[in-house]
């Protein structure tokens, strides 16, 4: 699996999550989020510069799982990548 990183962007708060997703040698076509304890994947919205956002009416519950489909057709899933108590500007990589 190529290296993937998730950077929590400025503006993220309890009801808004903005994440820059980088995938070695590829770009994201679709990114989805599953909150802790949730049974459903929700689509994130593509913004400028590879930033993906999600807005919620209720406070978001971490840690957060992500799955994605890349422009080259790669599909992957990563559990608990961004922790519940994330730091704005921090870059998180899946644990190995």
């Amino acid at each position: 699996v190529p290296k993937v990183t998730f950077t929590v962007e400025k503006g993220s708060n309890e009801k808004h999550l903005a994440v820059l997703v980088k995938y070695e040698g590829d770009t994201m076509a679709e990114v989805e989020l599953r909150e802790h304890g949730s049974d459903e994947w929700v689509a994130m919205t593509k913004g400028e510069g590879g930033v993906w956002t999600f807005d919620s009416e209720e406070p978001l519950q971490g840690p957060f799982n992500f799955r994605f489909l890349t422009e080259k057709g790669m599909k992957n899933v990563f559990d608990d990548v961004v922790p519940e108590k994330y730091t704005i500007g921090a870059t998180y990589a899946p644990e190995e």
Epitope: V4, W41, L69, V77, D80, E96
Partner: antibody, heavy 114, light 105 residues
Framework: LESGPGLVKPAQTLSLSCAVS??????????WSWIRQHPGKGLEWIGY???????YYNPSLKSRIAMSVDTSENKFSLRLNSVTAADTAVYYC??????????WGQGTLVTVSS | ELTQSPSSLSASVGDRVTISCRAS??????LNWYQHKPGKAPKLLIY???SLQSGVPSRFSGSGYGTDFTLTISSLQFEDFASYYC?????????FGQGTKVEIK
């Protein structure tokens, strides 16, 4: 590749493992799954596990299931306790990429009988 | 919950075959199709309702959105006699339909 006993006695525990080749479980990116098919029936989800140990179990089987991962041996395992004849099935391990089951094992028949 | 129809069908080589899968709630395009032959591992055919998995013949196609989905085999070949399953990927439970068996007429 699934491995384990083909015959299990009622009330005992069914134990299966799946050896993963062609990539490291530890590198992440996938859920590692178990699916079964009862004779003449359809496919039934058992559950899946992430390399960190996070699990999702079929609610109807949850009370009897345990899944685990051994990253050092690059394999994952299923334990199903208190088995009955209704657990007789072909058991498959598979890789779940978050969307699809893209790679499957060949399956192993487990018969529950005394 | 996913409901497939018919549960079985008989067809001849060269026939156009369609299998339906209906979801109990909207799942957008989060729907996959698998082929399963006795004694073999199931094989992914279609993902995201209409995307053909690499290596799968173009006679297989998928369509649909929301709650109603279709798998079509444009010209049935001998090797296509098998069972077919839909599966949703919106929820963490990744539920399967009950299957459709395609038999030789």
């Amino acid at each position: 590749l699934e491995s384990g006993p083909g015959l299990v006695k009622p009330a005992q525990t069914l134990s299966l493992s799946c050896a993963v080749s062609g990539g490291s479980i530890r590198s992440g990116g996938y859920y590692w799954s178990w699916i079964r098919q009862h004779p003449g029936k359809g496919l039934e989800w058992i559950g899946y596990i992430y390399h960190s140990g996070n699990t999702y179990y079929n609610p109807s089987l949850k009370s009897r299931i345990a899944m685990s991962v051994d990253t050092s041996e690059n394999k994952f395992s299923l334990r199903l306790n208190s088995v009955t004849a209704a657990d007789t099935a072909v058991y498959y391990c598979a890789r779940l990429d978050g969307y699809t089951l893209d790679i499957w094992g060949q399956g192993t028949l487990v018969t529950v009988s005394s | 919950e996913l409901t497939q129809s018919p549960s079985s069908l008989s067809a001849s080589v060269g026939d156009r075959v369609t299998i339906s899968c209906r979801a109990s709630q909207r799942i957008n395009t989060y729907l996959n199709w698998y082929q399963h032959k006795p004694g073999k591992a199931p094989k992914l055919l279609i993902y995201a309702a209409s995307s053909l998995q690499s290596g799968v013949p173009s006679r297989f196609s998928g369509s649909g959105y929301g709650t109603d989905f279709t798998l079509t085999i444009s010209s049935l070949q001998f090797e296509d006699f098998a069972s077919y399953y839909c599966q949703e990927s919106l929820s963490a439970s990744y539920t399967f339909g009950q299957g459709t068996k395609v038999e030789i007429k």
